[in-house]
């Protein structure tokens, strides 16, 4: 599994009610960590294993720097405003972090944004910096000149993010390292006269990334899918939906394919006729192929025009097969 | 350059009539983070809803989700309510109990 | 361990040039900067310009430009300073050292001095 | 440039007594990335001089803890706790903050 570590800075040259006019974020993976803002001018933990596990020293030590940070951040923006010779509302936003890849190599950036928009870029290989417009460029000449500093933020990256992140992934390990399947129901919905959509959907899973394919008669179809992207549920998990339109005359044989760490899915559309519905699971080497009469991992519901196939990997038991 | 938000409104379990649930509404790919959520039932600001802390994506661009307790039922309708900058008129995206 | 070790004492005439070296030994070469320092007899420590033998980008001090010249050679883990047009205010000792690597942000290891006399 | 200003020249002590050397920097050298590059260096007569410490506070390694670095923003301050016979010699601060990097121009520590 990969995992990234992220700190990411905003300053707003309009402050709001919800905004004020600097923010400092952390996050492991999609996890929040840290926090700190002009406001509360305080670093406090986002998550409860990051509060339990580092010490109030470490909170103080981090709070006086973040101090500086935001001095220096603000006027970093007041300076580019001068430059492009804007007022109003602007936005300069800076991104630093590394990713931990499953196969043990890394990853590190750092880069700059304003207004939104890519402003500079870190190269930690090459040690320079990309400039995205005439005023980066004057910010790129000054910064490659000192060389420490290109040094530390190298370093930083390569060595230091790196270790960071492995002692926070430790520190997160139930949370993170975590693993929840899906639940995966098809459903079938006449959306307009003639028009008949099979929608696939998975709820309850960690971590967020899933793969979900639509196939039709055992070849994945590309067109005419629509996809409700991976949203968050609030609770720690996350849910998604592919649907596709599709002529109810047809003959054609829909079926749901989801992947989530290395646990296949297959659930078949329900049709209206036929009385056996299969749901497969492949994880390793073990095939589970389910028959809808007294199982109770299906349900097969008649409500309306809807229909209904559920997968609930809860109640499976695969034995000693990886999963 | 303003970017508008996208709004998506769905519930955190299968809804079932009657059946106490969440209703999250998630505004993502928004800039600047300068922005407004309300939820509404039957088109009435709901008072009671919780917010997270803006959060920042790798495109620079933010997000947010709100949340309320909600029951739903047959007749009655949900929706969430966005005011941006990068919009002339607040959007109001409803809850579609298929999606 | 760790060494910096310098080119000995060059003695040279005004108008000429020279160029000092500076071995380094028991470390990753190109993960460190490389630092030169100037020191007139009797005087104090005066920063020349740094070189990052990886990236083989370089920084001076302005009131050196167009005097020292750095460059760096990673297939034999030397660094050079070449100095032009030499007058009696360059008559001093130079040093190099190396700077910081992850946690030791400082001029850990320096080179023992090369001695620069500009003498007609 | 950033100008760093040493005081005093030169500090004569007894064995054993307190010495403490100042550094002013002309400019904050806190950098962007909320470093302070501010070391303090000891060099003996005939020698190539030697890191006591680093990032204001940390001492090198090896360098006896009697030798503390405090300070921020643009005041810096070196503190022998009991000097003794091995500590003659003349310190410099250096600021590696903003280029050009800068050193100070020396405090040379000997017998009253």
């Known amino acids: 599994r990969t995992h990234s570590l992220r700190y990411f800075r905003l300053a707003v040259s309009d402050p709001g009610p919800v905004v004020p006019e600097f923010i400092s974020v952390g996050y492991v993976d999609s996890h929040p960590i840290t926090t700190y803002d002009s406001v509360t001018r305080q670093k406090e933990p986002k998550a409860p294993w990051m509060a339990e596990n580092l010490a109030p020293d470490h909170w103080e030590r981090y709070t006086q720097l973040l101090r500086g940070w935001q001095q220096t951040f603000k006027a970093e923006l007041r300076h580019l405003q001068r430059h492009y010779n804007h007022s109003g509302l602007h936005t300069y936003q800076r991104m630093i972090g590394c990713e931990l890849l499953e196969d043990g190599s890394t990853t590190g950036f750092l880069q700059y944004a304003y207004d939104g928009q890519d402003f500079i870029i870190f190269n930690k290989d090459t040690l320079s910096w990309l400039a995205m417009d005439y005023v980066a460029h004057i910010t790129k000449q000054a910064w490659e000149a000192n060389l420490h500093e290109l040094q530390y933020q190298k370093n930083w990256l390569e060595e230091e993010c790196i270790a960071w992140l492995k002692r926070f992934l430790e520190y997160g390990r139930d949370t993170l390292e975590r693993t929840e399947h899906p639940v995966v129901r098809t459903t079938r919905k006449e959306t307009f006269p003639g028009i008949t959509t099979f929608f696939c959907r998975a709820h309850g899973f960690y971590p967020p990334e899933i793969s979900m394919t639509w196939m039709k008669n055992g070849e994945e179809i590309a067109q005419e899918v629509d996809y409700g992207g991976v949203l968050p549920s609030g609770d720690g998990t996350y849910q998604t939906w592919l649907s596709v339109n599709l002529d109810p005359q047809s003959n054609d044989v829909y079926s749901c394919h989801v992947e989530h760490c290395g646990r296949q899915m297959v659930l078949e559309a329900p049709r209206e006729s036929g009385d056996i519905l299969r749901v497969s699971t492949i994880s390793g080497t073990t095939i589970l192929i389910i028959a809808l009469a007294g199982v109770g991992v299906l349900i097969w519901r008649r409500s309306q025009e809807l229909k209904e196939v559920m997968y609930q990997p809860t109640q499976v038991n695969e034995g000693s097969s990886p999963s | 350059i303003q970017k508008t938000p996208q709004i998506q409104v769905y519930s955190r379990h299968p809804p079932e009539n009657g059946k106490p649930n969440i209703l999250n509404c998630y505004v993502t790919q928004f800039h600047p983070p300068h922005i407004e959520i309300q939820m509404l039932k039957n088109g009435k600001k709901i008072p009671k809803v919780e917010m997270s802390d803006m959060s920042f994506s790798k495109d620079w661009s933010f997000y947010i989700l709100a949340h309320t307790e909600f029951t739903p039922t047959e007749t009655d309708t949900y929706a969430c309510r966005v005011k941006h900058a990068s919009m002339a008129e607040p959007k109001t995206v409803y809850w579609d109990r298929d999606m | 361990q760790v060494q910096l070790q310098q080119s000995g004492t060059e003695l040279v005439r005004p108008g000429t040039s020279v160029k000092v070296s500076c071995k380094a030994s028991?470390?990753?070469?190109?993960?460190?900067?490389i630092e030169w320092i100037k020191q007139r007899p009797g005087q104090g420590l005066e920063w020349i310009g740094v070189i990052n033998p990886g990236s083989g980008g370089i920084s001076y001090n302005e009131k050196f430009k167009g005097k020292a010249t750095l460059t760096a050679d990673k297939s034999s883990s030397t660094a050079y300073m070449q100095l032009s047009s030499l007058t009696s205010e360059d008559s001093a000792v130079y040093f190099c050292?190396?700077?910081?690597?992850?946690?030791?942000?400082?001029?850990?290891?320096w080179g023992q001095g090369t001695s620069v006399t500009v003498s007609s | 440039d950033v100008l760093m200003t040493q005081t005093p020249l030169s500090l004569p002590v007894s064995l054993g007594d307190q010495a403490s050397i100042s550094c002013r920097s002309s400019q904050s050298i806190v950098q962007g990335s909320g470093n302070t590059f501010l070391d303090w260096y000891l060099q003996k007569p005939g020698q190539s001089p030697k890191v006591l410490i680093y990032k204001v506070s940390n001492r090198f390694s090896g360098v006896p803890a009697r030798f503390s670095g405090s300070g921020s923003g643009t005041d810096f301050t070196l503190k022998i706790s009991r000097v003794e016979a091995e500590d003659l010699g003349v310190y410099y601060c250096?600021?590696?903050?903003?280029?050009?990097?800068?050193f100070g121009g020396g405090t040379k520590l000997e017998i009253k």
């Open positions: 250096f600021q590696g903050s903003h280029v050009p990097y800068t």
């Open positions: 028991g470390y990753a070469f190109s993960n460190y900067l």
């Open positions: 050292a190396r700077w910081g690597y992850l946690y030791y942000y400082t001029m850990d290891h």
